[in-house]
Structures are given as structure tokens and as C-alpha cells.
């Protein structure tokens, strides 16, 4: 029951997190015009990953897309890439985790397969969250650097006669959404990995006994025992045609993913 709850909660938390990452990526307010200690302008500038916008006191908002790809700063491209990778991994993770949920029965899927899928989705959520946090942090670092650079030469002009006030940008709402969303996705991923350990069946405390038939040796696993052996493993009481007697542990040649947790 606790495993199901942990898995379900991990899924929900990750779902909220990925929705937040998508929202943050699409938001226009990654950086907003710094209004503190600045002359009050009748326009408010803010920028996203895909376009920059200007909101006037009049009520009009004008947004212009970044139609160039090569002309954009490498850092912005990197942030875009990190956010997109985060979304893609998160989306795949969600898809995998839906099938991995203990409360959903799909055919005769084994607990072992569900455990593997839970772990896979958990890892994907963790990487997705890290991508989002990294992307937002890179952008934030870029803003801080530019902020202090523009503060250093806040007023530029010809001999101090004509002054041009440089627009300084500070953290926008999207950064906070991204950080929180990335964190939630990360937490959700960790919860999925924890749930995976609970889903994995315990190793048996006894060895499978080998019975010698007159014709050839056939080792049988005890009936009703569903071993989790991962991808390409022997399950469902399959016969192992082999010369001598072996223990169950020796037969298990392909370790399952959750063995490494």
C-alpha cells in the first residue's frame, strides 16, 4: 500500500513539475525590466526564451519573436536546449510511469517489469528536473552578469551631455516557476525510484533443488515463484535445460535494473 502511494504521489508530483517546466519554457517573463533605482519609464520590457515583449502604459503589448537562430547568444541556445531536453525526458518518463503504476493492470505485466519501468521513469524525472534547474540557473547567472555589467555603465553618452539610460533586467516569474517545477520533477523522480525498490520482489531464502531424471537433467524452479529477473530473463517456471544441478542464483544471468538501486 505504501509503495503504491509513494509511486502514485511520485507520479503526481512529477506531472505537476513537468507541467511547470513546460509553462516556464513557454513563458515570456524570464527576465523583466528592473524598476528599482531606475528612471520610471512608461514602457515595461520583459523577455522570454522565444520572444521579447514591451508593455506600454497605454495598455498595448508588443511581442517580437527571435526569428534568428545564429544571431542568438550561445547561452540562450543552451538554456533552450536544456529546457527542451527536460520536457522531452519528462514526457517520456510520464508515459513510461503510467504503465508502471501499480494501480493500473495491463495484461499480465509482471511486478518485475513494473519495477523496471518505475525506475526508468524515476531516472528520467530526475534528469528532467536537473535539466530544468540547470537551464534556469544558467539563465539566472547570465542575468546577474549582465545586470552588474549594465550597472557599471548605467549612463552612457557623449561627454555627459546626452544620457542614454540602459535597460537593466532582473529575474522574471518564469525563473521561479522553472526552479520550483524542476525541483518537483526531481522529487517526483526520487519518489519513483524509492517506490521501485518496494515493487521489486524479495530474493528467496532457499535454493532451487535439482532433481535428476533418468534421461537427462532438468532443473525446475519451484512452482508459483515469480522471480524478477529483468529484461530477457527466465520467468514463469520455465525449464532450464542444463547438465548439472544449479542454484536459482546461478541461473539468473541477466541482472534486473533495480538490483543496482
Amino acid at each position: 500500500m505504501a509503495v503504491t502511494a509513494c509511486q502514485g504521489l511520485g507520479f503526481v508530483v512529477s506531472l505537476i513539475g513537468i507541467a511547470g517546466i513546460i509553462a516556464a519554457t513557454c513563458m515570456d517573463q524570464w527576465s523583466t525590466q528592473d524598476l528599482y533605482n531606475n528612471p520610471v519609464t512608461a514602457v515595461f520590457n520583459y523577455q522570454g526564451l522565444w520572444r521579447s515583449c514591451v508593455r506600454e502604459s497605454s495598455g498595448f503589448t508588443e511581442c517580437r519573436g527571435y526569428f534568428t537562430l545564429l544571431g542568438l547568444p550561445a547561452m540562450l541556445q543552451a538554456v533552450r536546449a536544456l529546457m527542451i531536453v527536460g520536457i522531452v525526458l519528462g514526457a517520456i518518463g510520464l508515459l513510461v510511469s503510467i504503465f508502471a503504476l501499480k494501480c493500473i493492470r495491463i495484461g499480465s505485466m509482471e511486478d518485475s517489469a513494473k519495477a523496471n519501468m518505475t525506475l526508468t521513469s524515476g531516472i528520467m524525472f530526475i534528469v528532467s528536473g536537473l535539466c530544468a534547474i540547470a537551464g534556469v540557473s544558467v539563465f539566472a547567472n547570465m542575468l546577474v552578469t549582465n545586470f552588474w555589467m549594465s550597472t557599471a555603465n548605467m549612463y552612457t553618452g557623449m561627454g555627459g551631455m546626452v544620457q542614454t539610460v540602459q535597460t537593466r533586467y532582473t529575474f522574471g516569474a518564469a525563473l521561479f516557476v522553472g526552479w520550483v517545477a524542476g525541483g518537483l520533477t526531481l522529487i517526483g523522480g526520487v519518489m519513483m525510484c524509492i517506490a521501485c525498490r518496494g515493487l521489486a520482489p524479495e530474493e528467496t531464502n532457499y535454493k532451487a533443488v535439482s532433481y535428476h531424471a533418468s534421461g537427462h537433467s532438468v532443473a525446475y524452479k519451484p512452482g508459483g515463484f515469480k522471480a524478477s529477473t529483468g529484461f530477457g530473463s527466465n520467468t514463469k517456471n520455465k525449464k532450464i535445460y542444463d547438465g548439472g544441478a544449479r542454484t536459482e542464483d546461478e541461473v539468473q544471468s541477466y541482472p534486473s535494473k533495480h538490483d543496482y538501486v
Epitope: V40, V43, N45, R55, S57, S58, G59
Partner: antibody
Framework: EVQLLESGGGLVQPGGSLRLSCAAS????????MSWVRQAPDKRLEWVAT????????FYPDSVKGRFTISRDNSKNTLYLQMNSLRAEDTAIYYC???????????WSQGLSVTVSS | DIVITQSPLSLPVTPGEPASISCKSS????????????LTWYLQKPGQPPKLLFY???TRESGVPDRFTGSGSGTDFTLKISRVEAEDVGVYYC?????????FGGGTKLEIK
């Protein structure tokens, strides 16, 4: 057609108060920023106040800050200018104007005379 | 506050002749966010409220004849009339629409010679 109709002007003593109203029609009032501009006799235009759209931000020049208050009632499509502690130099024709692209003022009222005199 | 300086103060012009009004700002009115200049031009005829001619320094308001042209960027702006007509008389104002407080130029009175 955009229409801006003012009311509330007149003669007032120094230190007195007056409330100007500007009833708007012909456009979605709540979506646009609005301003008050005045013009003293034979003088240049002087911006008095702005109520920006979306965010309830109000702006004033130092000459009227603390004495004048701009407000709006979107349900009544009306802009107001509450003028307190009036001085002789506040004597002017007061216009209300609708903000447009580039924070320009594309529609103006006909103007309302306010005279501050003892 | 931003100081807007307009010149000349008075501009007598013969009908059919061109006219030019200059407007200078103490600070740049160019917004880096959209690369637009927040300078507005108005014409005020006697006994009337001002009428919008140009916004964003060079965008002509609908209904304004194309003999009027607005130009300039940053701190220096110009309003040109290619061929002055009798109906063009009045006081022309330029306005800073970028920084609060919004400030107007002193005005240029265009009159027919």
C-alpha cells in the same frame, strides 16, 4: 466613435478642492490607459496624471504629487481627477485623453476650465 | 525630468513651401526592448484640443495627410511638411512618451506668410 465628455470644472478658491469627471464611450474603457493633461492660458501643454492599463499604476509630475489623485471606475467607464489644495498656478484648461500606441494620446476631450482664484 | 526643446518657436511659411520643426530630448527616447522611439507629435489648432499626428516618432496616425513626415531617433527628431497648406496652421508640440513625467516641448507656431 470615441467620445470623452468632461464635467466638474469651475471656479474654486485657493486651498479648495474639485473633482473632474470624464465619461468615456466608443471603446473598451478598461483596456486603455488614460491621462489628464492641462494647458494654462497661452502656455505649453502639461501632463498631469496617468492611470496605466492593467496593473492599477498611477503616475504624477512633482507639481501635483500628493495633491491630485487620478482614479477610474471601469463599470461606469469614467475617469476622475480629484484635485485638493488647489493653487493659483493650477488654473488651466483640463483635458482627459485616451492613451494609444507608443503612449500617445489619440483621443482628447474638449477641455474643461478650472480657475483657482480668491 | 526630461527636457524637450523645440525649435523654431515660430515658423512663418508660404503655402506650397516645405516646413521643418526640430525636437530635441535631454535623454534618448529609444526603447531597447522594441527599438522604438517614444516621441509623439501633436497639432493644436486655436480653440481645439491637440490632435495626434505621429507616434513612435515616425508612425503616422490614420487620417493625417502623407505630406507630413516624422523622423529621427534617440534624442533628435524632426517633423516635416512637404507642402504647407492653409489648414496646417496651429501649434505643433512634440512629447516625450517614454519617461515619467511625460513632458511636452514649448511648441512651434506655424503661420501662413
Amino acid at each position: 466613435e470615441v467620445q470623452l465628455l468632461e464635467s466638474g470644472g469651475g471656479l474654486v478658491q485657493p486651498g479648495g478642492s474639485l473633482r473632474l469627471s470624464c465619461a468615456a464611450s466608443g471603446f473598451t474603457f478598461s483596456k486603455f490607459g488614460m491621462s489628464w493633461v492641462r494647458q494654462a492660458p497661452d502656455k505649453r501643454l502639461e501632463w498631469v496624471a496617468t492611470f496605466s492599463s492593467g496593473g492599477d499604476y498611477t503616475f504624477y509630475p512633482d507639481s501635483v504629487k500628493g495633491r491630485f489623485t487620478i482614479s477610474r471606475d471601469n463599470s461606469k467607464n469614467t475617469l476622475y481627477l480629484q484635485m485638493n489644495s488647489l493653487r493659483a498656478e493650477d488654473t488651466a484648461i483640463y483635458y482627459c485623453a485616451k492613451l494609444y500606441y507608443g503612449n500617445s494620446m489619440d483621443s482628447w476631450s474638449q477641455g474643461l476650465s478650472v480657475t483657482v482664484s480668491s | 525630468d526630461i527636457v524637450i526643446t523645440q525649435s523654431p518657436l515660430s515658423l512663418p511659411v508660404t503655402p506650397g513651401e516645405p516646413a521643418s520643426i526640430s525636437c530635441k530630448s535631454s535623454q534618448s527616447l529609444l526603447n531597447s526592448g522594441n527599438q522604438r522611439n517614444y516621441l509623439t507629435w501633436y497639432l493644436q489648432k486655436p480653440g481645439q484640443p491637440p490632435k495626434l499626428l505621429f507616434y513612435w516618432a515616425s508612425t503616422r496616425e490614420s487620417g493625417v495627410p502623407d505630406r507630413f513626415t516624422g523622423s529621427g531617433s534617440g534624442t533628435d527628431f524632426t517633423l516635416k511638411i512637404s507642402r504647407v497648406e492653409a489648414e496646417d496652421v496651429g501649434v505643433y508640440y512634440c512629447q516625450n512618451a517614454y519617461y515619467y513625467p511625460f513632458t511636452f516641448g514649448g511648441g512651434t507656431k506655424l503661420e501662413i506668410k
